[in-house]
């Protein structure tokens, strides 16, 4: 049974140019996290964390994300077409797959927010 | 459009290292993907055995830990395989390939290794 | 480790025939699955990532399906540049692991 639950950054902006922390945390759960997957809002993967093979950053995406912190990843020299959706998948034993959602908002203005708060999706 | 290619000798003596290098031309190895090697057994069994990341660091199949090693020169666009104390079991042809998401997109074209006194 | 069981270990099929390969991880690894076909004296060649994505510049008539631990390579409408042989891989753990391969030769 899947007990656990995932908590996402939810709905963050930041400042183009600049860089945003993608982060999800899955908690209430004893599972064995075996990998995590970040998607962009058209579904291409960004990079792969697996338990066992460390790290995989998709190479068009090598100059602007860093893996990290922890399970999660960093935006870097956003742009305004890095508005939308981004997805953490999270495969874990015995329970299975957890999902998260975050939506980036990326501001021509220099008062950009970083709205950071954890919350439940 | 990019190539790997395997070199090194076809023969080694028992107990002593086999070195070989894989040559990759039209792409640099510090821009993305895995770079690995892989050997296929003259019983059509294949293995993989470790690879080395853009940024140089590795992993390895448990059951060679002890004595395989990969590293790279960036400047030449090289990297290589060293496998220590063989035997007549680490005969095999040995492949070096371009790793995404650790499957296998491009693959050189193989070298036969030896292990013979 | 995850063990990958590949079935039949050869098969004997004609010209314009569909075939069926299939392969069996001992644990679940999602879609985390490739194939790839190696003839004669050549390196392998990838035919399909995660399951069922077919590899740039490669034939339609391929196509991989399955999930979990239960995945198919199906071969439509063999060709004679099709015969040689075909292995799966895991892609999602230490060590990457292959099955034992399947030979497709000519009736």
């Known amino acids: 049974m899947m007990t656990g639950t995932i908590e996402t950054t939810g709905n963050i902006s930041a400042k183009k140019g600049g860089s945003v922390i993608l982060q999800c945390h899955l908690s209430s759960t004893m599972a064995q996290v075996t990998q995590v997957n970040w998607e962009q809002h058209d579904h291409s993967l960004l990079a792969i964390r697996n338990a066992e093979l460390g790290w995989h950053i998709y190479p068009a995406f090598k100059d602007r994300v860093a893996p990290g912190p922890g399970l999660g990843l960093t935006l870097q020299s956003l742009t305004m077409n890095d508005t939308g959706e981004y997805f953490c998948t999270y495969h874990t034993y015995p329970d299975g797959t957890y999902r998260g959602r975050i939506f980036l908002e990326v501001l021509e203005s220099s008062v950009a927010e970083h709205s950071a708060r954890f919350q439940i999706p | 459009d990019v190539q790997l290619q395997e070199s090194g000798p076809g023969m080694v003596k028992p107990s002593q290292s086999l070195s070989l290098t894989c040559t990759v031309t039209g792409y640099s190895i510090t821009s993305g993907y895995d770079w690995h090697w892989i050997r296929h057994f003259p019983g059509n069994k294949l293995e993989w055995m470790g690879f080395i990341s853009d940024s140089g660091s590795t992993k390895y199949n448990p059951s060679l830990k002890s004595r395989i090693s990969i590293t790279h020169d960036t400047s030449k666009n090289h990297f290589f395989l060293k496998l220590n104390s063989v035997t007549s079991e680490d005969t095999a042809t040995y492949y070096c390939?371009?790793?995404?998401?650790?499957?296998?997109?491009?693959w050189g074209t193989g070298t036969t290794v030896t292990v013979s006194s | 480790d995850i063990q990958m069981t590949q079935s039949p270990a050869s098969l004997s099929a004609s010209v314009g025939e569909t075939v069926t390969i299939t392969c069996r991880a001992s644990e679940n690894i999602y879609s985390y699955l490739a194939w790839y076909q190696q003839k004669q004296g050549k390196s392998p060649q990838l035919l399909v990532n995660?399951?069922?994505t077919l590899a740039e510049g490669v034939s339609s008539r391929f196509s991989g399906s399955g999930s979990g631990t239960q995945f198919s390579l199906k071969i439509n409408s063999l060709q004679p540049e099709d015969f040689g042989s075909y292995y799966c891989q895991h892609h999602y753990g230490n060590p990457l692991m292959f099955g034992a391969g399947t030979k497709l030769e000519l009736k």
């Open positions: 390939a371009r790793g995404s998401y650790w499957y296998f997109d491009v």
């Open positions: 995660n399951a069922k």
